[in-house]
Interface confidence: low
């Protein structure tokens, strides 16, 4: 009898009520492997989720998050609110990065600026809430003429307002 069930392909289940005939999965259910005794209920992408891939008889639905949210967890089991660059999500919502830290993404936490001096380098471009510092050559690497020159103003991306 077990051999009969093993012949049931994905998209079907081995129906004990019908002499172990392979029956198609009912609507809104699937079996992704052969030899299944039941079909699994399809995931519904509702609420904060939107459908990325519809459920079929052989594979579960796949969900994505609505605009303003991003996926968390295995198979996008949760959606987390986006923040702006230069912010992190806290218990009280999106908060600006503290001075000396930055976040260049809509998710994750603020991270400390790189400490250029640890690598024997100097700060070429100052950090912002959205961007890490850019390290340049160490003062010793600069030629005597260049070392006494006025350091360059921090570079800014087009459309980027000063902090």
């Amino acid at each position: 009898l077990q051999d009969l069930c093993s012949n049931c392909p994905a998209g079907t289940f081995c129906d004990n009520n019908r002499s172990q005939i392979c029956s198609p999965c009912p609507p809104n259910s699937f079996s992704s492997a052969g030899g299944q005794r039941t079909c699994d209920i399809c995931r519904q992408c509702k609420g904060v989720f939107k459908t990325r891939k519809e459920c079929s008889s052989t594979s579960n639905a796949e969900c994505d998050c609505i605009s303003g949210y991003h996926c968390l967890g295995a198979e996008c089991s949760m959606c987390e609110q986006d923040c702006k660059q230069g912010q992190e999500l806290t218990k009280k919502g999106c908060k600006d990065c503290c001075f000396g830290t930055f976040n260049d993404q809509k998710r994750g936490i603020c991270r400390p600026w790189t400490n250029c001096s640890l690598d024997g380098k100097s700060v070429l471009v100052n950090g912002t809430k959205e961007r890490d510092v850019v390290c340049g050559p160490s003062p010793a690497d600069l030629s005597p003429g260049a070392s006494s020159a006025t350091p360059p103003a921090p570079a800014r991306e087009p459309g980027h307002s000063p902090q």
Epitope: R43, G47, Y69, S77, E80, Q81, K91, K92, G93
Partner: nanobody, 122 residues
Framework: EVQLVESGGGLVKPGGSLRLSCAAS????????MSWFRQAPGKGLEWVSH????????DYADSVKGRFTISRDNAKNSLYLQMNSLRAEDTAVYHC???????????????WGQGTLVTVSS
């Protein structure tokens, strides 16, 4: 099992008011941030507001700020949305949602109510 049941929707004229309620059961209500979302006909889901478990932290979408007020009564396991100065563009199905206890803005797909329809029309 987590259950969220919204009520209070209906037909209202522009400029009018409605108060939505969400009755929660099956979890420690006061431990969780709660949210209101809405879905206008043919549109995507839009976050409206959320409130922390104690009610001390509240935030609103810009589109409803100054017109809508979120509140909760933990003794009654209930969430509310007072909607004033309603506009035609507020027409939508309103859903309450339980956010993840670790972080506001994080919602899993099981913890949603079926919604209550608000229609703003003259």
């Amino acid at each position: 099992e987590v259950q969220l049941v919204e009520s209070g929707g209906g037909l209202v004229k522009p400029g009018g008011s409605l108060r939505l309620s969400c009755a929660a059961s099956g979890f420690a209500f006061s431990d969780y941030y709660m949210s209101w979302f809405r879905q206008a006909p043919g549109k995507g889901l839009e976050w409206v507001s959320h409130i922390s478990g104690s009610g001390t932290t509240i935030d609103y979408a810009d589109s409803v700020k100054g017109r809508f007020t979120i509140s909760r009564d933990n003794a009654k396991n209930s969430l509310y949305l007072q909607m004033n100065s309603l506009r035609a563009e507020d027409t939508a199905v309103y859903h309450c949602a339980r956010e993840d206890s670790r972080m506001p803005g994080t919602t899993d797909f099981d913890n949603w109510g079926q919604g209550t329809l608000v229609t703003v029309s003259s």
